[in-house]
Interface confidence: medium
């Protein structure tokens, strides 16, 4: 009679994580009598996967019920596959004895596990940066297999080209990770912009995963200042305004100085938002010119988002206005908030 052969028809099997893997094995003869065992790997360190004679293998079931005489199908199904299950599986025929002795092995079936990449996580720089500066964004995704993966960067739908990507580890592994760094040049219009990292993998069936970062968390747009003198409201009063334009984020503190002395400090509250996401704010100072004998240097000083202060000054020509007798005060007014400075 022809000698028994152990046939594993599939050289390789690929299964998505979480699914079941069926590993096929048949034998060609009933002789010699003895059990079949399944192993992962070969050699002395091989791992026993299934042996009904002894042991407990809750994830393994037999494909054939093998409750017929002369059964020759020893295929198994392994449930809830994870990347850790990847490897080469051998169906091995033993000859019955005390103990059973290995008689013949199948050629092996390589099980590869298709693991989905995790949702990409995009992170930006720790500190804010201003327009015209280049900032780096990183994108990370883990746990995918096989190794082949595609990563793209977009800014507002436009694909970026300045990035570097690494997939680790370089050698064989049960699962892989990807790390990519993209460089993005900021513009003043980027408050509403988004940077997107897009990952495509065979397990995603053409529906890539995306991670996003809002540039509003990265950008700082410094304000432009303009100090103007409004027409005289009353005979001895001049309204001076400081227009703070196009700044982001909103955190801003404004100080008025008269000839270098602090007159008033306030925090931006009722700002107006521009279409591009930046803010405008206006502060005004009502100056009683009759309180001054000499010209007054008015300075609008702005500290934005913890950065060094920027300022803009305006010279108020006192000589151009008649002085009011008996008055020695300059009154400032912003809205309903009035204070007298002596």
């Amino acid at each position: 009679e022809e000698e028994l052969q152990v046939i594993q028809p599939d050289k390789s099997v690929s299964v998505a994580a979480g699914e079941s893997a069926i590993l096929h094995c048949t034998v060609t003869s009933l002789i010699p009598v003895g059990p079949i065992q399944w192993f992962r790997g070969a050699g002395p360190a091989r791992e026993l996967i299934y042996n009904q004679k002894e042991g407990h293998f809750p994830r393994v079931t037999t494909v054939s019920e093998s409750t017929k005489r002369e059964n020759m199908d020893f295929s198994i199904s392994i449930s809830n596959i994870t990347p850790a299950d990847a490897g080469t599986y051998y169906c091995v025929k033993f000859r019955k004895g005390s103990p059973d002795t290995e008689f013949k092995s199948g050629a092996g079936t390589e099980l590869s596990v298709r693991g989905k990449p995790s949702a990409p996580v995009v992170s930006g720089p720790a500190a804010r940066a201003t327009p015209q500066h280049t900032v780096s964004f990183t994108c990370e995704s883990h746990g995918f297999s096989p190794r082949d993966i595609t990563l793209k960067w977009f800014k507002n739908g436009n694909e970026l080209s300045d990035f570097q990507t690494n997939v680790d580890p370089v050698g064989e592994s049960v699962s892989y990770s990807i790390h990519s760094t993209a460089k993005v040049v900021l513009t003043r219009e980027d408050v509403h912009s988004q940077v997107i990292c897009e990952v495509a993998h065979v397990t995603l069936q053409g529906d890539p995963l995306r991670g996003t970062a809002n540039l509003s968390e990265t950008i700082r747009v410094p304000p432009t200042l303009e100090v103007t003198q409004q027409p005289v409201r009353a005979e001895n009063q001049v309204n001076v305004t400081c227009q703070v334009r196009k700044f982001y984020p909103q955190r801003l503190q404004l100080t008025w100085l008269e000839n270098g002395n602090v007159s008033r400090t306030e925090t931006a509250s009722t700002v107006t938002e521009n279409k591009d996401g930046t803010y405008n704010w206006m502060s005004w100072l009502l100056v009683n010119v009759s309180a001054h004998r000499d010209d007054v240097k008015l300075t609008c000083q702005v500290e934005h988002d913890g950065q060094p202060a920027v300022s803009k000054s305006h010279d108020l020509k006192v000589s151009a206005h008649p002085k009011e007798q008996g008055s020695n005060t300059a009154a400032e007014n912003t809205g309903s908030n009035e204070r007298n400075i002596y």
Epitope: G34, S66, K68, R69, E70, K96
Partner: antibody, heavy 124, light 110 residues
């Protein structure tokens, strides 16, 4: 838990037909095979036949000509019919749940659960 | 088709060790697996050994099975004999499509 229970007449006339029922609970007849085993008084047990999980049957060749095994999976019952009974068919009749050890070319059958048995006497 | 032969009876003292043989009449004892069953009077049999030497988890480790090719026999060994071990014991194997039982052995604990 797994339970098997045989039922049928305790007394059968010679040359008549024996009908036994095995009612099971705790497992599915679609997943396990069942055998009938009898033990004549003062002798060792004798395997009579098997109802496979998929509905096929196998019989002891010495009894095949007068034995029939069937089932009703909806009622969880397996039936034995044996005709032309003689006095030497007297004994205890058991239904047993079969286990086979996967990975042997002749799956090693052993009987992991037995019913309590029913005594059948063939006498006029 | 082979037969399996067991002694009609075996006896042993309490806490002693006994062995019940089961001899195969033709063919090699190693050509098929052997199981053993215990039957107390008035109770259904229970499987105590399967696949020559495997013990179901619920069975005491005082029970063990083996095969001996020189005598073409399987054996059931019970150590530290207890009164409750007094019962009938029978072996079982198979030939092609037929399951074959031994005639049974009555174990008496003295």
């Amino acid at each position: 838990q797994v339970q098997l229970k045989e039922s049928g007449p305790g007394l059968v006339q010679p040359s008549e037909t024996l009908s036994l029922t095995c009612t099971v609970s705790g497992f599915s007849l679609a997943s396990y095979s069942l055998s009938w085993v009898r033990q004549p008084s003062g002798k060792g047990p004798e395997w009579m036949g098997r109802m496979y999980y998929d509905g096929d049957t196998a019989y002891n060749s010495a009894l095949k000509s007068r034995l029939s095994i069937s089932r009703d999976t909806s009622k969880n019952q397996v039936f034995l019919k044996m005709n032309s009974l003689q006095t030497d068919d007297t004994g205890t009749y058991y239904c047993t749940r079969d286990r086979s050890m996967f990975g042997t070319d002749y799956p090693h059958w052993y009987f992991d659960f037995w019913g309590p048995g029913t005594m059948v006497t063939v006498s006029s | 088709q082979f037969t399996l032969t067991q002694p009609k009876s075996v006896s042993g003292a309490l806490r002693s060790t006994i062995t019940i043989p089961c001899e195969r009449s033709s063919g090699d004892i190693g050509d098929s697996y052997v199981s053993w069953y215990q039957r107390h009077l008035g109770r259904p049999p229970i499987n105590v050994i399967y696949a020559d030497d495997q013990r179901p988890s619920e069975v005491s480790d005082r029970f063990s099975g083996s095969i001996d090719s020189s005598s073409n026999s399987a054996s059931l060994t019970i150590t530290n004999l207890q009164m409750d071990d007094e019962a009938d014991y029978f072996c079982q194997s198979y030939d092609s499509k037929i399951d074959i039982f031994g005639g049974g052995t009555k174990l008496t604990v003295l």
